[in-house]
């Protein structure tokens, strides 16, 4: 019989008939080595490959760019699936983003992109956005025209200020930008008037710090 | 480039009116909070309003509190200021100022005006 | 309002040789968020001014690193470590921790 094709993602995953939310091994093209993921298979028909998830504050975010371009933390909590994942994965075929917030009072928002797409390390894993749509605000707190990837050893922004360093995490900042979900994790009542937290600005506005986020991919054609 | 490119000073008569205008360019100015800042002939910095990105909160000195009025048209890239019952006190250079960060969250002034030179004389 | 508090307010330093301004807050500038709302600006003869420190001690872009911001709660300092004659100029603290934004006096830097 044909040899069965190795998963490219958790689209791919779910196609294949497991659609039990959970972790899962992807192979992604010229990535040398298989990739452990979250499949989050519930959300909006499922296939989504989590990209990125915080929950309780028990990673650490404010890293150098090698961490973020390699990915740190557990897929089972809270990651960061990694600049050079993201980009090898999107460079496969075309992708929808999905982004799901909660709030401290238990409000949950989302928002979503029809396209996205990162560059290669040399652009700066510059983020590419198309679509926005969702209930986390009417515009998009994701910078829609381009920005490049800063951490705190890497000031990429359009800032006279270093934003990763200020703001905490490596993020796609502006100068700084509406958005920074991988800020620093506030808990209840710590969480207002924060700077550097978790911040969606067109859901809970300049300085409120998330309680959880989930950002993941889909492809387009699932 | 981000340039903040002032008008409208002049010498004007105590008690008369006068519009001060900022043009944007280079940067995504409804993101922004504005402020307006003068200084007196050979004296030093003095704050004088702001408005947020959107307009929506705006505050004044209370020197100039019911007698001036910030303003934006972020469709045009513009912040105004409206001087009325002006005072020979309000003499001074008043530049506009771009908060250093976006979408209000404030964190001093990273770009200036040329500055615009108001006059009140009678 | 807060009354922002420098010294000295004349500076005359020689070409190579360090400055150091001090400006006190007449209440901490400590926000609950952590962060010291303390700007510096230098103001250059007939300029507008630039912004050469935020938030207490981060070098705004294209600064030189001879300047450095340190402190925090009320007593702030800016240095330069080896002065040079495009430094002169009128320099003024700056707080946004408490509404309204209040200045210093400012200080002037001159080349003896």
């Known amino acids: 019989r044909e040899e069965e094709k190795p998963f490219r993602d958790c689209a791919d995953v779910y196609q294949a008939g497991f659609n039990k939310s959970g972790i899962y091994t992807i192979y992604i093209n010229n990535m040398p080595e298989p990739k452990k993921v979250f499949c989050n298979m519930d959300v909006n028909g499922g296939g989504w490959t989590v990209i990125q998830h915080r929950e309780d504050g028990s990673l650490d975010f404010q890293r150098g760019w090698k961490e973020y371009k390699m990915g740190f933390g557990n897929p089972s909590g809270e990651y960061w699936l990694g600049n050079e994942f993201i980009f090898a994965i999107t460079s496969q075929r075309q992708y929808m983003l999905r982004i799901e917030l909660m709030d401290w009072e238990g409000n949950r928002a989302y928002s979503q992109y029809d396209r996205f797409h990162i560059g290669n390390e040399k652009q700066n894993y510059r983020l590419y956005l198309k679509g926005h749509t969702g209930t986390a605000g009417k515009q998009s707190s994701l910078i829609l025209h381009g920005a490049d990837f800063s951490t705190k050893d890497a000031d990429n922004d359009n800032c006279m200020c270093k934003c990763a360093l200020m703001l905490t995490g490596g993020w796609w900042f502006d100068a700084c930008g509406p958005s920074n979900l991988n800020g620093m994790f506030y808990t209840a009542g710590q969480n207002h008037g924060k700077l550097n937290g978790i911040k969606w600005h067109y859901f809970k506005g300049p300085s409120y710090s998330l309680r959880s986020t989930t950002m993941m991919i889909r492809p387009l054609d699932f | 480039e981000v340039q903040l490119v002032q008008s409208g000073g002049g010498v004007v008569q105590p008690g008369r009116s006068l519009r001060l205008s900022c043009a944007a360019s280079?940067?995504?100015?409804?993101?922004?909070?504005m402020h307006w800042v003068r200084q007196a002939p050979g004296k030093g910095l003095e704050w004088v309003s702001y408005i947020s990105s959107s307009g929506s909160t705006i505050y004044y000195a209370d020197s100039v509190k019911g007698r001036f009025t910030i303003s934006r048209d972020n469709a045009k890239n513009s912040l105004y200021l409206q001087m009325n019952s002006l005072r020979a006190e309000d003499t001074a250079v008043y530049y506009c100022?771009?908060?250093?960060?976006?979408?209000?969250?404030?964190?001093?002034?990273?770009?200036w005006g040329q500055g615009t030179l108001v006059t009140v004389s009678s | 309002d807060i009354v922002m508090t420098q010294s000295p307010l004349s500076l005359p330093v020689t070409p190579g040789e360090p400055a150091s301004i001090s400006c006190r807050s007449s209440q901490s500038l400590l926000h609950s968020n952590g962060y010291n709302f303390l700007d510096w600006y230098l103001q250059k003869p007939g300029q507008s001014p630039q912004l050469l420190i935020y938030l207490g001690s981060n070098r705004a872009s294209g600064v030189p690193d001879r300047f450095s911001g340190s402190g925090s709660g009320t007593d702030f300092t800016l240095k330069i470590s080896r002065v040079e004659a495009e430094d002169v100029g009128v320099y003024y603290c700056m707080q946004g921790t408490h509404w309204p934004p209040t200045f210093g006096q400012g200080t002037k830097l001159e080349i003896k």
């Open positions: 100022a771009r908060d250093l960060l976006d979408y209000d969250i404030w964190t001093g002034y990273g770009y």
């Open positions: 280079g940067f995504t100015f409804s993101s922004y909070g």
